[in-house]
């Protein structure tokens, strides 16, 4: 039989699904997917699904660009340009679309639950009622192009369909333990209890990084994670916010220490003599074991909040380090000195 | 509520092309992809293409390379797909369906254009 | 040929429970959320499950959908008769760089 009733179907926002893997919950973070290490490299532009981004979006990528080295198998080919967020996942910026709610309709109506986000730091560029989440640092879809164009995406290199592995190389200015060893020596003063100094940034309670800087970031291809613990805990740390399907992961108790080495070392890396003042500062290369997985399916609402680092996880890991990786020496000018050159150099390279 | 409604049926002779709209409403058009499936009489559903309806970026299944165009017209919100070379093969019901944008799936369609090739 | 493989048809008598398997493989299941559709006589699929095991909403509880490794079932407990359809699940495919869909299951309802 030829289906030729109009098919209608209403729903309470546009496209208001909400990702995860329990039911009706909605708002995970990230993409890649729990079935070994497959994906991150195909957007969801790739598929088809998610937000649509604008040409100029595509062409001159409105992207933030990763700040890891990714190290990765070559992907499948394709025509559409590929992009990574500044955490090195792929991502995908949902325009704030909603349709007004409908009524009563058919009975092969498909509707979807609204949800009832906060309010966005962003306008709204599509002219309706925000949809999610804080959107900070991403941007709706751009005016649409001429109509009926068929302009193609710009092609650009190819992403890799398994997940990357990220490497974030530290450089810092060449050692020299003997001219390090003679300034230190010279300091005026008895080197401060390191246990107490609060960082330059902040302390490690105060932790937490909230990447915003962005503009739209284009996730690849929707990839699945159902299965897969966070990060930075177990499920039972994943807190869903029903107004607008955002996720903020709290971890009360992050241990670092057998994944991350501070950028020029966490306590246990350095040696206090107490005559000279001597510090012996070892730099280690900062490296994220992607142990575990993201939890998002495809995800089109996808908002990034890095884990929040509350209380101190042990006296040992990162009390003394700042969010830069920078040690305290507010009483010793002259390694105060040398934490500010290397602090300089790694804000040179954008770390 | 989100609505897409397709063209009326065609009867095409082999080797002509045929074009079938998609009319949205309900929704920020330009805010989702656009994708089109067909399915054969007494058939599965195949996947043939989506265009990107904010910019009008267009990626086709390997099967339909060269012969679909996908395009769509802001103006109007309606999203377009044309099938040329037409052979008694591509007898199909021709859906347009929207690009989920927090899901992964397509999650409405419209109620499909019967495209008849006689010979 | 269809990408996915899905049992031809499937049946249970009202108030069962009719499990109808979707199996793919790396490329597609395997690195990919799963959706299911349900195509009543004479109409166009409707969206039943989306991102492997979400319902959207008025899709009744009684529809269940779960993945694991390169296999998505899905599950229909408390079988009824307007049940009576065809299923297809669909997914990417990162070979194919396409959508793929299996060849669809006939549910049927016996009295």
């Known amino acids: 039989a030829e289906p030729r009733q109009e098919f209608e179907v209403m729903e309470d926002h546009a496209g208001t699904y909400g990702l995860g893997d329990r039911k009706d919950q909605g708002g995970y973070t990230m993409h890649q997917d729990q079935e070994g290490d497959t994906d991150a490299g195909l957007k969801a532009e790739e598929a088809g699904i998610g937000d649509t981004p604008s040409l100029e979006d595509e062409a001159a990528g409105h992207v933030t660009q990763a700040r890891m080295v990714s190290k990765s198998k070559d992907g499948t080919g394709s025509d559409d340009k590929k992009a990574k967020g500044a955490d090195g996942k792929t991502k995908i910026a949902t325009p704030r679309g909603a349709a007004p709610p409908g009524q009563k309709g058919q009975a092969n109506a498909t509707r979807i639950p609204a949800k009832t986000p906060p309010a966005p730091k962003t306008p709204p560029s599509s002219g309706e009622p925000p949809k999610s989440g804080d959107r900070s640092g991403y941007s709706s879809p751009g005016s649409p192009g001429t109509p009926g164009s068929r302009s193609r995406t710009p092609s650009l290199p190819t992403p890799p369909t398994r997940e990357p592995k990220k490497v974030a190389v530290v450089r810092t200015p060449p050692k020299s333990p003997s001219s390090a060893k003679s300034r230190l020596q010279t300091a005026p003063v008895p080197m401060p209890d390191l246990k107490n100094v609060k960082s330059k940034i902040g302390s490690t309670e105060n932790l937490k990084h909230q990447p915003g800087g962005g503009k739209v970031q284009i996730v690849y291809k929707p990839v699945d994670l159902s299965k897969v613990t966070s990060k930075c805990g177990s499920l039972g740390n994943i807190h869903h916010k029903p107004g607008g399907g955002q996720v903020e992961v709290k971890s009360e108790k992050l241990d670092f220490k057998d994944r991350v080495q501070s950028k020029i070392g966490s306590l246990d890396n350095i040696t206090h003599v107490p005559g000279g003042g001597n510090k012996k500062i070892e730099t280690h290369k900062l490296t994220f074991r992607e142990n575990a997985k993201a939890k998002t399916d495809h995800g089109a609402e996808i908002v990034y909040k890095s884990p929040v680092v509350s209380g101190d996880t042990s006296p040992r890991h990162l009390s003394n380090v700042s969010s830069t990786g920078s040690i305290d020496m507010v009483d010793s000018p002259q390694l105060a000195t040398l934490a500010d050159e290397v602090s300089a150099s790694l804000a040179k390279q954008g770390l | 509520q989100v609505n897409l409604r397709e063209s009326g049926a065609e009867v095409k002779k082999p080797g002509a092309s045929v074009k079938v709209s998609c009319k949205v409403s309900g929704y920020t058009f330009t805010g989702y992809y656009m994708h089109w499936v067909r399915q054969a009489p007494g058939q599965g559903l195949e996947w043939m293409g989506w265009i990107n309806s904010n910019s009008g970026a267009t990626k086709y299944a390997q099967k339909f390379q060269g012969r679909v165009t996908m395009t769509r017209d802001t103006s109007i919100t309606t999203a377009y797909m044309e099938l040329s070379s037409l052979r008694s093969d591509d007898t199909a019901v021709y859906y347009c369906?929207?690009?989920?944008?927090?899901?992964?799936?397509?999650?409405?369609w419209g109620q499909g254009t019967l495209v008849t090739v006689l010979a | 040929s269809y990408v996915l493989t899905q049992p031809p048809s499937a049946s249970g008598t009202p108030g069962q429970r009719v499990t109808i398997s979707c199996s793919g493989g790396s490329s597609n299941i395997g690195s990919n959320a799963v959706s299911w559709y349900q195509q009543l006589p004479g109409t166009a699929p409707k969206l039943l499950i989306f991102?492997?095991?979400q319902r959207p909403s008025g899709v009744p509880d009684r529809f269940s959908g779960s993945k694991s490794g390169t296999s998505a079932p899905l599950a229909i407990s408390g079988l009824q008769s307007e049940d009576e359809s065809d299923y297809y699940c669909a997914t990417w495919d990162d070979s194919l760089n396409g959508w793929v869909f299996g060849g669809g299951t006939k549910v049927t309802v016996r009295s």
């Open positions: 991102t492997n095991d």
């Open positions: 369906a929207r690009g989920a944008r927090d899901g992964y799936g397509f999650d409405y």
